[in-house]
């Protein structure tokens, strides 16, 4: 079991000098600082008893094992439920204390309750102020029974519970109709998930035989000792004021543990210290009586006499809970209570023994869990002792449970069990993560769920050049840091695997699963020149670039223009997606628009240093389209075209455009100006005897408009080869623009 | 669902015996205090007896005490009311209700007792 | 055995509030916060609207309220609907030993 410790200071006469705290003796408890340690949690849990709010109450972490709870400031805001959270993955345990106000109408006999599944439990609610109404019972805050006022026997209201099962368990409480939540008794029942001396799943296996008031965990078999007792089977008590799994605790202040009450994991629940009593835990055992709520009586035998805090002490010559036994018997000496090895380790296991006559190597003997004897190898004799050592076979998994050491002369015999552990090595069931590249290093996250036990002692990471039959490189690394792989090649898959380790021998884990993680390439340095650009249209712009002359080939993959609206906020972006390119055509811009362009050159997913930028500003938008276009041969070099004025024009038109283009000719095509703009109709002169043109025109205002639908017309006869197209409109000769 | 059936109403003449029983499904019956309240016709709600879920403890109006006896039986998810000495005044609907902390959170249909001669 | 005092009758149109009133002494209502409710429909058992003073059972319409003071207990419908026409009677637990309960003499609900 987890060792987990909830302490309550009941000195109820003065709330603000009440305090829970919350004791943890596990290894690396309450650190919180990473995903292997969760932090101690102390908190009132008003699921279940709800109190009128008060002031927050004050958490206070001493050290890392260690969370205080104070700032009570009136009797009812101890009335409740208050829980402490501890220990790590499938060990975290919750621990739970329920306080009653010592003013209730109805006090508990006692309130925590343990049973075995299937008993009867009987929960009894002590009348302390009389009411002459109903009496309500709730199980975990929802109407459970009723009785009659009349109904108390001997002052006590009680709530019988037959054949309880687990789904049984939770807080009960019994209150007067009418009466504040505060005056009601509360309890709590714990409802093993095993019969008596029962655990594991099936309920199959037997309960080690818990000593001096120790409770048989049902899930794992282990006892959960009372506090000031220790022990596989608590058979060892611990000094006066001392508590927790190893006594490594110690209760606070001068008096003791007097006034403490303790609540330790289920299936224990909770109880005064060992050698206290009472609702309060101020009362000392009677004489005769010992351990926790002084529930044990000591029956000291050969002179015996009786410890309220550990039971019998035994005068020379006897040992033994009742000092039954003659010193002349062997005993087992200083054998641990447990024991933890990891799986596949051959470990070696002491058992030192002593007794009239003197224990050998023969009468010393293991007995494993599933019956196997295993005979010592070698012992050591000394003066007062005698050591056997054994070497165990190969652990496996079944190995986990309860050994007993037993020695046997002819003075007697006596055996001790321990309890033997065997761990898992972890195995990690993810792959490391990445968090970050560059060209040559990797940031990793070595933090990967796991199977097996932890805790995790030493995170190791391997890796190599994917497809590389070189060594693996292997770096330790400490679990709760990310790690940075350097010295790495460029543009290059590395395999990665996380191997973990739990301490002891044998705890190295197998290796987790591969993960391929990819350099970056190297960044791009050079930076281009805008060398030009030009507008094509309205919504269209010609950009050219160079790069600067360096040896040795080009380092990058293209090029990304980059294109600021400033006015909308707005950036566009264009790849370009060859490195040998120094010119691109962007189109769908936004006529009238004031640009701000730049380029870069990348490589992978790095850019480079940008250009200096460039500003451009669009021509707005132009009018609508001249409609019903047509051309008419007028001679062997002329064509007159006739049109209609566009539509819904946004203003006076300043001139027209007409394109002329030889059908089917390579060439680039030649743009006429028109520049009255009244007209609608023009004559295109110095054209080519029977050849077949192309024609289209557009109008301008403050830009260039659309273009018109393109018409064809051939130049009549065969006349000579003329220099070039003109335009006339009404015998008016215009100037050429190309 | 909870649901509570009355039934063994009828007609019986003045100073007649009747026993009427209420079928209880839907929830834990021995743990719930049960009440039998009536409805003379055109007339308003009358409590008429109460028993704990122990069966021990019993208590009745003024009108039908010594007369009247209600009880249950746990095992079988029944509550009764036994009604000796019938009057004309006893003729009414009567309900079968569970109580749940001084309120009546769930009711019958009712059955119709007449006393006439 | 008294009874609770209730108005015989109230009456409201669709989409008013109306409350009824529920008087008793200071061994029930007023000793007590175990006011009830109940709806009765005509030819139907009555139905739980309040429980505890101002508890509302799942199911029943937030349009239904209810409150204390003193020795009066108050039950107020809002928004008044067609169907809330009906009969309310009010119940309290007491402290007399020997009875379960004790009824109002019930208010007709009329919808104009």
């Known amino acids: 079991a987890v060792d987990l410790t909830l302490l309550a200071n009941l000195r109820l006469t003065d709330p603000q000098r009440f305090f829970l705290t919350c004791v943890s003796g596990e290894a690396g408890a309450g650190r919180g600082s990473d995903a292997w340690g969760p932090p101690l949690l102390l908190e009132k849990d008003d699921r279940i008893v709800r109190t009128p709010p008060g002031p927050p109450l004050r958490l206070a972490r001493n050290g890392s094992h260690q969370v205080t709870l104070r700032g009570f400031s009136k009797p009812s805001d101890l009335v409740g439920v208050f829980s402490c959270v501890g220990g790590a993955g499938a060990r975290r345990t919750r621990v739970i204390y329920v306080h009653n106000s010592p003013g209730a109408h109805l006090l508990p006999d006692k309130v925590t309750h343990t049973v075995n599944k299937g008993d009867t439990a009987v929960l009894s609610a002590r009348v302390h102020k009389e009411k002459q109404t109903d009496v309500i019972w709730k199980s975990n805050g929802s109407y459970f029974y009723t009785l009659d006022w009349h109904e108390a026997q001997d002052g006590r209201f009680l709530l019988q519970l037959p054949n309880v099962q687990p789904p049984s368990s939770g807080i009960y409480s019994a209150t007067y109709l009418e009466a504040s939540p505060l005056g009601s008794a509360f309890f709590r029942l714990i409802v093993r998930g095993c019969g008596a001396g029962r655990w594991g799943p099936g309920c199959t296996k037997e309960c080690p035989g818990c000593l001096h008031g120790g409770v048989c965990h049902d899930h794992d078999g282990e006892c959960v000792c009372p506090p000031g007792f220790t022990g596989t089977r608590c058979e060892q008590a611990c000094r006066e004021g001392r508590f927790g799994q190893s006594c490594q605790e110690q209760c606070p202040g001068i008096s003791g543990c007097r006034g403490l009450t303790f609540c330790l994991p289920d299936p224990y629940g909770c109880s005064c210290g060992s050698g206290w009593r009472g609702s309060q835990c101020q009362e000392a055992c009677a004489p005769g009586h010992f351990g926790a709520d002084c529930r044990l009586q000591c029956q000291c035998q050969n002179g015996g006499t009786c410890d309220r805090f550990s039971g019998c002490v035994c005068p020379s010559g006897w040992h033994g809970v009742h000092c039954e036994k003659s010193d002349r018997i062997p005993q087992i000496l200083n054998m641990a209570s447990e024991l933890e090895f990891n799986l596949e380790t051959m470990p070696r296991i002491n058992c030192a023994a002593a007794g009239n006559p003197f224990p050998v190597r023969g009468s010393i003997e293991l007995r494993k869990p599933d019956g196997t004897v295993l005979l010592s190898t070698k012992a050591i004799v000394e003066p007062e002792k005698t050591t056997a050592e054994f070497e165990v076979p190969r652990l496996v998994l079944a190995d986990s449970g309860f050994w007993e050491c037993r020695v046997s002369t002819s003075g007697g015999q006596d055996s001790r069990r321990f309890k033997v552990n065997v761990k898992v090595p972890p195995v990690p069931l993810a792959a490391p993560r990445l968090l970050t590249k560059q060209s040559r290093q990797l940031v990793v996250s070595p933090l990967v769920s796991f199977s097996g036990d932890g805790p995790i002692s030493t995170v190791r990471l391997h890796y190599r050049p994917q497809d590389s039959t070189m060594d693996w490189s292997t770096i330790v690394v400490d679990p709760s840091e990310n790690v940075t792989l350097m010295n790495l090649r460029p543009k290059t898959g590395y395999s990665v695997r996380v191997q973990l380790s739990r301490p002891g021998e044998g705890g190295e884990g197998a290796w987790g699963p591969p993960t391929l993680m990819t350099t970056d390439c190297p960044e791009p340095l050079l930076q281009p020149w805008l060398e030009g650009w030009h507008v094509e249209g309205t919504d269209r712009l010609r950009v050219s670039w160079s790069l600067p002359l360096v040896p040795g080939p080009l380092v990058g993959d293209g090029f990304l223009l980059r294109l600021w609206d400033g006015t909308r906020g707005q950036e566009r972006r264009e790849n370009v997606s060859s490195p040998q390119a120094r010119t691109a055509l962007l189109t769908g811009l936004t006529p009238g628009t004031h640009y701000q362009l730049d380029v870069q050159l990348y490589h992978c997913t790095l850019l480079g240093p940008a250009s200096p930028p460039a500003h451009v500003l669009l021509p707005p938008s132009g009018p609508p389209a001249p409609r019903h276009l047509h051309a008419q041969a007028l001679s062997d070099s002329e064509i007159q075209l006739t049109w209609k004025h566009p539509e819904a024009l946004p203003g006076p038109i300043s001139k027209y455009v007409v394109e002329v283009q030889v059908a089917g000719g390579a060439g680039d095509p030649l743009w006429i100006d028109v520049d009255r703009p009244e007209e609608t109709s023009t004559i295109i002169r110095g054209l080519n005897a029977s050849t077949r043109y192309l024609f289209r025109m557009r109008a301008s205002i403050q830009g260039l408009g659309d273009w018109s639908n393109t018409v064809e017309e051939s130049t009549l006869g065969n006349g000579l080869q003329a220099e070039g197209p003109v335009q006339e409109s009404r015998a008016a000769e215009e100037g050429l623009d190309q | 669902e909870v649901q509570l059936l009355e039934s063994g109403g009828g007609l019986v003449q003045p100073g007649g015996s009747l026993r009427l029983s209420c079928a209880a499904s839907?929830?834990?019956?021995?743990?719930?205090?049960m009440d039998w309240v009536r409805q003379a016709p055109g007339k308003g709600l009358e409590w008429v007896s109460s028993i704990y879920p122990s069966g021990g403890f019993t208590y009745y109006a003024d009108s039908v005490k010594g007369r009247f006896t209600i009880s249950r039986d746990n095992s079988k998810n029944t509550l009764y009311l036994q009604m000796n000495s019938l009057r004309a005044e006893d003729t009414a609907v009567y309900y079968c209700?569970?109580?749940?902390?001084?309120?009546?959170?769930?009711w019958g249909q009712g059955t119709l007792v007449t006393v006439s001669s | 055995q008294s009874e609770l005092t209730q108005p015989a009758s109230v009456s409201g149109s669709p989409g008013q509030s109306i409350t009824i009133s529920c008087t008793g002494t200071s061994s029930d209502v007023g000793g007590y916060n175990y006011v009830s409710w109940y709806q009765q429909h005509p030819g139907k058992a009555p139905k739980l609207m309040i429980y505890?003073?101002?508890n509302r059972p799942s199911g029943v319409s937030n349009r239904f309220s209810g409150s204390k003071s003193g020795n009066t207990a108050s039950l107020t419908i809002s928004g008044l609907q067609a169907e809330d026409e009906a009969d309310y009677y009010c119940s309290s637990y007491t402290s007399s030993s020997t009875l379960g309960g004790v009824f109002g003499g019930g208010t007709k609900l009329t919808v104009l």
């Open positions: 839907g929830f834990t019956f021995s743990k719930y205090k």
């Open positions: 209700a569970r109580e749940k902390m001084a309120t009546m959170d769930y």
């Open positions: 505890e003073v101002s």
